[in-house]
């Protein structure tokens, strides 16, 4: 289970993403925003500094909308 405000690396990071995102799946990096112009990665944001549930959830894939 996810423990808030801690660093996550290795398989523990992958398992936590799988737990948080479930069937949606997840990405290891997000596309660069027009503001930052550089891509951010889950490792940079969660492995070398603490990250919370809200941040983890931003790496979840968005499920396809059903018609």
């Amino acid at each position: 289970a996810y423990r808030p405000s801690e660093t996550l690396c290795g398989g523990e990071l992958v398992d936590t993403l799988q737990f948080v995102c479930g069937d949606r799946g997840f990405y290891f990096s997000r596309p660069a925003s027009r503001v930052s112009r550089r891509s951010r990665g889950i490792v940079e944001e969660c492995c070398f500094r603490s990250c919370d549930l809200a941040l983890l959830e931003t790496y979840c894939a968005t499920p396809a909308k059903s018609e």
Epitope: C9, G10, G11, L13, D15, F28, V43, E44, C47
Partner: antibody, heavy 120, light 107 residues
Framework: EVQLLESGGGLVQPGGSLRLSCAAS????????MDWVRQAPGKGLEWVSV????????IYADSVKGRFTISRDNSKNTLYLQMNSLRAEDTAMYYC?????????????WGQGTMVTVSS | DIQMTQSPSSLSASVGDRVTITCRAS??????LNWYQQRPGKAPRILIY???TLQSGVPSRFSGSGSGTDFTLTISSVQPEDFATYYC?????????FGGGTKVEIK
């Protein structure tokens, strides 16, 4: 051919410093995190440190924290390990290794190693 | 830190024997367990990753299994080049840790 080649080892006195290098070839170095692993004579393997692909993040074993610094120069395809305040227990063969360890992966490529001996 | 315990520390086998090495983690690591072979005077090389996936180029006589805390490396029919030391390693969390090694010797 994918290859890692370490250099910089040698004999150093306790308290001294040494800088190890690891030259990478045959793969896109900047896309991989890199690690250092060491092996004392006649002993098992001990993980030392990892650096992210960009060089922006590092993690160290407690046994070397505050004394060793891992870094990389992606423009030169080279990994480094700056070793300060060396102790007798740092005597070991030092290997650089490639692997997606930050994502739970294994060390898939190893260098041949460079020997560091700390002795007076 | 996660402690990795390998057993036995050494074993003797004859060519053609089936060899089994076990590795136990001090806490669950899912399948984030890797196996390496190290011949005398050489660098380690990867054999198996994520518990059971055979690295490309590694002979099929090597196999791995396990999940959670208990893992096994099996050599179905030991060949002369397999006499070496084998290490398990967890990649679940940092610091990364290795087992103490198992030396496979010729009987």
């Amino acid at each position: 051919e994918v290859q890692l080649l370490e250099s910089g080892g040698g004999l150093v006195q306790p308290g001294g410093s040494l800088r190890l290098s690891c030259a990478a070839s045959g793969f896109t170095f900047s896309k991989y995190e890199m690690d250092w692993v060491r092996q004392a004579p006649g002993k098992g393997l001990e993980w030392v440190s990892v650096i992210s692909s960009s060089g922006g993040g590092t993690i160290y074993a407690d046994s070397v924290k505050g004394r060793f610094t891992i870094s990389r120069d992606n423009s030169k395809n080279t990994l480094y390990l700056q070793m300060n305040s060396l102790r007798a227990e740092d005597t070991a063969m030092y290997y650089c290794a490639r692997g997606r360890t930050l994502y739970g992966g294994a060390f898939d490529i190893w260098g041949q190693g460079t020997m560091v001996t700390v002795s007076s | 830190d996660i402690q990795m315990t390998q057993s036995p520390s050494s074993l003797s086998a004859s060519v053609g024997d089936r060899v089994t090495i076990t590795c136990r983690a001090s806490q669950p690591i899912n399948t984030y367990l890797n196996w390496y072979q190290q011949r005398p005077g050489k660098a380690p090389r990867i054999l198996i990753y994520t518990s059971s996936t055979l690295q490309s180029g590694v002979p099929s006589r090597f196999s791995g299994s396990g999940s959670g805390t208990d893992f096994t490396l099996t050599i179905s029919s030991v060949q002369p080049e397999d006499f070496a030391t084998y290490y398990c390693q967890q990649s679940y969390s940092f610091p990364l840790t290795f087992g103490g090694g198992t030396k496979v010797e010729i009987k």
